[in-house]
């Protein structure tokens, strides 16, 4: 029961152009090209997009025209391979152009860079931005798509269209406001933060599909959709999972036009069938397409249906469990996951998947045993420690967060994770630990029933960032092991890591701890990052340093920065006081 059109089209490019409309077509092609060729200048991409668009129009006019029958991968790949500087700019990626489809597209996908060497996006003055917006709105918005897409090569393309729409609305409103900055800056901050979160969530979906396969993604989707739509029956959830898997497979595979088109179809189907899906969809379904799709993706869990009987009867107490499992494994396990998830909106998706895996493993073992029923009779007892582990961890960490506040909680995690995996680059450890620390303000405010799904599923997203960054330049076998062994056990794997006793402390380098007056003009966030970078380096130099030692050094460091930033001659203060601080820190840590 798929919702997607299966009829063949003479010209795929004409089909998608007609379905999506010119504006969305051009935006999606620009995103696709920027996600593949992340270093190319904006103007080059715009030129390529315009050429593709003109070609698409000829195909709309006559689907039998020359080359109109070619696949989108062939058309887009051919276009990308016309870039003159491909070899100089991208090195071995240029070798992709010698391949045929589908290998050529796979090759481009493999060269997507999660951490491209691009300058940080600096936000110009509000008046400068508003002038640029008014001078050429279309170019201004295209530039936004381009800059986000090239920095986030797995950003969910149809969702990026939604962000661009909000970006445009912010400028349209605020550039007319009396106080432009007061109106615009909070909106841009919100879009930036939401955009980073959206990118990271999508990166996990793509990693799930690409590294662990379709079955892993479908299991995740069954659990999440069953929690979200507990009144929907299994066949409905299964259908939504199949369609959602197709959408994300397409987007993660660079098939952005198909992905956006199919996502729109799925939103349409959900809204046409909301009575059998969820009572929470009404407001979403009254919105325009981009807002509607976003709203559905974020919709709150529906209320659990009344009269759900115990699962034990069908999945533990019945003597026919093995027969049902043997004759319909996927349906039986899918039904187990669906039934368990719809009863447990208070569990994280990854926990539900661990329970389902435990159940499957138990059946595999017990159904081959002499007395299967006796063997699997206590399987639900095996769930208890699996449930308690994240509950306890969240309780402890929320207590620590409430005690320390976000910045110091991040620091505690920085120390913890640097000691676990000290080989990982300092910028990665800072970025990942800062994001891990944000779980506190994001989730600890929630009541017990919402904490685990908030916290553990968020941690899965953040740890995936660590995994994809580490995969680019692997330095730690422990990280590789936790990242590759089991998608759902990544967080417990990292939690279980102790201090790496094999690590040889880093040589002391005074330059790492030399600071200048420029730190005084940084934002609070940037200043925190500088201090946290120093903290990671300290731990790398002295992995056995105690919490107390590190706290003392960091307190001294904060006082040093505050003192020198108030000094008349800041640079001299940083030079002289800095030397003293380094010496005192070395003494305090026994370096």
């Amino acid at each position: 029961r798929g919702v997607f059109r299966r009829d063949a089209h003479k010209s795929e490019v004409a089909h998608r152009f007609k379905d999506l409309g010119e504006e969305n077509f051009k935006a999606l092609v620009l995103i696709a090209f920027a996600q593949y060729l992340q270093q190319c200048p904006f103007e080059d991409h715009v030129k390529l997009v315009n050429e593709v668009t003109e070609f698409a129009k000829t195909c709309v006019a006559d689907e039998s025209a020359e080359n109109c029958d070619k696949s989108l991968h062939t058309l887009f790949g051919d276009k990308l391979c016309t870039v003159a500087t491909l070899r100089e700019t991208y090195g071995e990626m240029a070798d992709c152009c010698a391949k045929q489809e589908p290998e050529r597209n796979e090759c481009f996908l493999q060269h997507k860079d999660d951490n491209p060497n691009l300058p940080r996006l600096v936000r110009p003055e509000v008046d400068v931005m508003c002038t640029a917006f008014h001078d050429n709105e279309e170019t201004f918005l295209k530039k936004y798509l381009y800059e986000i897409a090239r920095r986030h090569p797995y950003f969910y393309a149809p969702e990026l269209l939604f962000f661009a729409k909000r970006y445009k609305a912010a400028f349209t409103e605020c550039c007319q406001a009396a106080d432009k900055a007061a109106c615009l800056l909070p909106k841009l901050d919100e879009l930036r933060d939401e955009g980073k979160a959206s990118s990271a969530k999508q990166r996990l979906k793509c990693a799930s599909l690409q590294k662990f396969g379709e079955r892993a993604f479908k299991a995740w989707a069954v659990a999440r959709l069953s929690q979200r739509f507990p009144k929907a029956e299994f066949a409905e959830v299964s259908k939504l999972v199949t369609d959602l898997t197709k959408v994300h497979t397409e987007c993660c595979h660079g098939d952005l036009l198909e992905c956006a088109d199919d996502r729109a179809d799925l939103a349409k189907y959900i809204c046409e069938n909301q009575d059998s899906i969820s009572s929470k969809l009404k407001e979403c379904c009254e919105k325009p397409l981009l807002e509607k799709s976003h709203c559905i993706a974020e919709v709150e869990n529906d209320e659990m249906p009344a009269d759900l009987p115990s699962l034990a009867a069908d999945f533990v107490e019945s003597k026919d469990v093995c027969k049902n499992y043997a004759e319909a494994k996927d349906v039986f396990l899918g039904m187990f996951l669906y039934e368990y998830a719809r009863r447990h909106p208070d569990y994280s998706v990854v926990l539900l998947l661990r329970l389902a895996k435990t159940y499957e493993t138990t059946l595999e073992k017990c159904c081959a045993a002499a007395d299967p029923h006796e063997c699997y009779a206590k399987v639900f007892d095996e769930f208890k420690p699996l449930v308690e582990e994240p509950q306890n961890l969240i309780k402890q960490n929320c207590e620590l967060f409430e005690q320390l506040g976000e910045y110091k909680f991040q620091n505690a995690l920085l120390v913890r994770y640097t000691k676990k995996v000290p080989q990982v680059s300092t910028p990665t450890l800072v970025e990942v630990s800062r994001n891990l620390g944000k779980v506190g303000s994001k989730c600890c405010k929630h009541p017990e029933a919402k904490r685990m799904p908030c916290a553990e599923d968020y941690l899965s997203v953040v740890l995936n960032q660590l995994c994809v960054l580490h995969e680019k330049t692997p330095v730690s076998d422990r990280v590789t092991k936790c990242c590759t062994e089991s998608l759902v056990n990544r967080r417990p794997c990292f939690s279980a890591l102790e201090v790496d006793e094999t690590y040889v402390p880093k040589e002391f380098n005074a330059e790492t701890f030399t600071f200048h007056a420029d730190i005084c003009t940084l934002s609070e966030k940037e200043r925190q990052i500088k201090k946290q970078t120093a903290l990671v380096e300290l731990v790398k130099h002295k992995p056995k340093a105690t919490k107390e030692q590190l706290k003392a050094v960091m307190d001294d460091f904060a006082a040093f920065v505050e003192k020198c930033c108030k000094a008349d001659d800041k640079e001299t203060c940083f030079a002289e006081e800095g030397k003293k601080l380094v010496a005192a820190s070395q003494a305090a840590l026994g370096l």
Epitope: E233, F234, A235, E236, S276, D307, L308, P309, S310, A312, A313, D314, F315, E317, S318, K319, D320, K323, N324, E327, A328, V331, F332, M335, E339
Partner: antibody
């Protein structure tokens, strides 16, 4: 509206066959274990069998061999094929929906029933 | 397959009375027992499942208890619409299910 409607009942000669249908609306049959239950005039409820979400059919001991449960998901319809009918098979035949895909009970949703009379 | 013995098979009572019907299984069925009410010419209606859970929409004067082999259905204060036949059903021990013989509740 979520409902079950049985059809196909009637009068049949001993030794004859009959196929009952149960049309489901408002939900997908494939998501549930679907049951047939009968009730002879003035008597209690008697479970005949069910087909679960894995398309595996189970029967009461007395029903094995003569009765067959099947379903057509595309038509969203459940069937009960009854062969070698006897006078004691005279009853109202109900279809009922299990709580889940592999549930043998409880049955919250029932059809109104269809009457089968076996007599010469 | 297990058997369910319901008692009494018939019972007369008055409006306002407290009524108890029992159901005994030939082997343990944990808490997997349901109670139904049936009126003439109608299909059964689910009252209680998993021995003691009240189905939504069913008046709170109905309650169920028990586990293992012995179960009871109690109507705390009989109303005129409660005169009907009541059945217990055991499920979950295998992919088969069994109904009790029924209890006909009539006006005294």
């Amino acid at each position: 509206e979520v409902q079950l409607v049985e059809s196909g009942g009637g009068r049949v000669q001993p030794g004859g066959s009959l196929r009952l249908s149960c049309a489901a609306s408002g939900f997908s049959l494939s998501s549930y274990a679907m049951n047939w239950v009968r009730q002879a005039p003035g008597k209690g409820l008697e479970w005949i069998g069910h087909i679960n979400a894995g398309d595996i059919a189970y029967y009461a001991t007395w029903a094995k061999g003569r009765f067959t449960i099947s379903r057509d998901n595309s038509k969203n319809t459940l069937y009960l094929q009854m062969n070698s009918l006897r006078a004691e098979d005279t009853a109202t035949y109900f279809c009922a929906r299990g709580a889940g895909g592999f549930s043998t009970g409880p049955f919250k949703l029932w059809g109104q029933g269809t009457q089968v009379t076996v007599s010469s | 397959a297990f058997e369910l013995t319901q008692s009494p098979s018939s019972l007369s009572a008055s409006v306002g009375d407290r009524v108890t019907i029992t159901c005994r299984a030939s082997e343990s069925i944990n808490s997997r027992l349901a109670w139904y009410q049936q009126k003439p010419g109608q299909p059964p209606k689910l009252l209680i499942y998993d021995a003691s859970d009240l189905t939504s929409g069913v008046p709170s004067r109905f309650s169920g208890s028990g586990s293992g082999t012995d179960f009871t259905l109690t109507i705390s204060s009989l109303q005129p619409e409660d005169f009907a036949t009541y059945y217990c059903q055991g499920y979950g021990g295998s992919s088969t299910t069994t109904f009790g013989g029924g209890t006909k509740l009539t006006v005294l």
